[in-house]
């Protein structure tokens, strides 16, 4: 049966918490990704940014989970209107910013 949206969001938060907790060496070898506006459409925008990181097992589960939240197909090289123009940040910072935002969504009961 389908997972309730609140449970799905909690599981995504859980995964991001695991990533931040278990981070020893630089996450994804310090790879840089496009920063995004943390507004509407955050899941697709986050996926569009992170999908460009390859060969990083630490975020593969996150990529799969975000795929479940995003209603359309996302492929590498896609550019979202939510991308912050010409701003790249490390994956570790991206994950932290996303985690803060998703925890607020959970606190506010915004699951979709």
């Amino acid at each position: 049966s389908p997972v309730p949206p609140s449970t799905a969001l909690k599981e995504l938060i859980e995964e991001l918490v695991n990533i931040t907790q278990n981070q020893k060496a630089p996450l994804c070898n310090g790879s840089m990704v496009w920063s995004i506006n943390l507004t509407a459409g955050v899941y697709c925008a986050a996926l569009e940014s992170l999908i460009n990181v390859s060969g990083c097992s630490a975020i593969e589960k996150t990529q799969r989970m975000l795929n479940g939240f995003c209603p359309h197909k996302v492929s590498a090289g896609q550019f979202s209107s939510l991308r912050v123009r010409d701003t790249k940040i490390e994956v570790a910072q991206f994950v932290k910013d996303l985690l803060v935002h998703l925890k607020k969504l959970f606190r506010e009961g915004q699951f979709n």
Epitope: S6, Q21, R107, F111
Partner: antibody
Framework: QVQLVQSGAEVKKPGSSVKVSCKAS????????MHWVRQAPGQGLEWMGT????????KYVPKFQGRVTITADESTSTAYMELSSLRSEDTAVYYC??????????????????WGQGTLVTVSS | DIVMTQSPLSLPVTPGEPASISCRSS???????????LEWYLQKPGQSPRLLIY???DRFSGVPDRFSGSGSGTDFTLKISRVEADDVGIYYC?????????FGQGTKLEIK
């Protein structure tokens, strides 16, 4: 260390406005919610509203709607509460407080864990 | 708005004795995300309030284990196992589940 430092006491005339500031240090305000709570002399605590400084979204108590404006300036790590059309019943100590997430827990408290020292606003003709 | 009703309003206690404060909400305060954002704050004379308990029963860091919270639905309790002179002040319950968030009217704990 975490600190919330509020602006000084104010004396205002009925019908005027007051703007109280709350300067944060030791954390990023965009990671938090910033709240405003007031306490009339000899009375209990009353939550007025909150802001998410990351996007400017606010929530207000209906009784203050239209009279209160909560804002935040990420660049100066400062939250503000402006109350207009002041009346004598608005005489109170106004507190700012933060609630923040925690890196290492899935289910965060987001309770008001740090408070400012309070700002006394006196409304008198 | 949800009304939070505390009892008693005044609580004289002998040092070393237990104390209990009740807080009743006018409706269920389970948040849509499944959490119950019921908190307890202590305001000592001349000071700003400080957080004691969050989410019904979780003690905030630095709060002595003499303090405990319990309850569910609409009925909540703060217990102090052995009151100390330093515990004097006004105790407030607070619900952060449904906007507008609301405080109880406060319970004044004093030493006999």
């Amino acid at each position: 260390q975490v600190q919330l430092v509020q602006s000084g006491a104010e004396v205002k005339k009925p019908g005027s406005s007051v703007k109280v500031s709350c300067k944060a240090s030791g954390f990023y305000i965009k990671d938090t919610y910033m709240h405003w709570v007031r306490q009339a002399p000899g009375q209990g605590l009353e939550w007025m509203g909150t802001i998410d400084p990351a996007n400017g979204n606010t929530k207000y108590v209906p009784k203050f709607q239209g009279r209160v404006t909560i804002t935040a300036d990420e660049s100066t790590s400062t939250a503000y509460m402006e109350l207009s059309s002041l009346r004598s019943e608005d005489t109170a100590v106004y507190y700012c407080a933060r609630s923040i997430y925690d890196d290492y827990h899935v289910d965060d408290y987001y309770a008001m864990d740090y408070w400012g020292q309070g700002t006394l606003v006196t409304v008198s003709s | 708005d949800i009304v939070m009703t505390q009892s008693p309003l005044s609580l004289p206690v002998t040092p070393g004795e237990p104390a209990s404060i009740s807080c009743r909400s006018s409706q269920n305060i389970v948040h849509i995300n499944g959490n119950t954002y019921l908190e307890w704050y202590l305001q000592k004379p001349g000071q700003s309030p400080r957080l004691l308990i969050y989410k019904i029963s979780d003690r905030f860091s630095g709060v002595p284990d003499r303090f405990s919270g319990s309850g569910s639905g609409t009925d909540f309790t703060l217990k102090i196992s052995r009151v100390e002179a330093d515990d004097v002040g006004i105790y407030y319950c607070f619900q952060g589940s449904h906007v507008p968030w609301t405080f109880g009217q406060g319970t004044k704990l004093e030493i006999k």
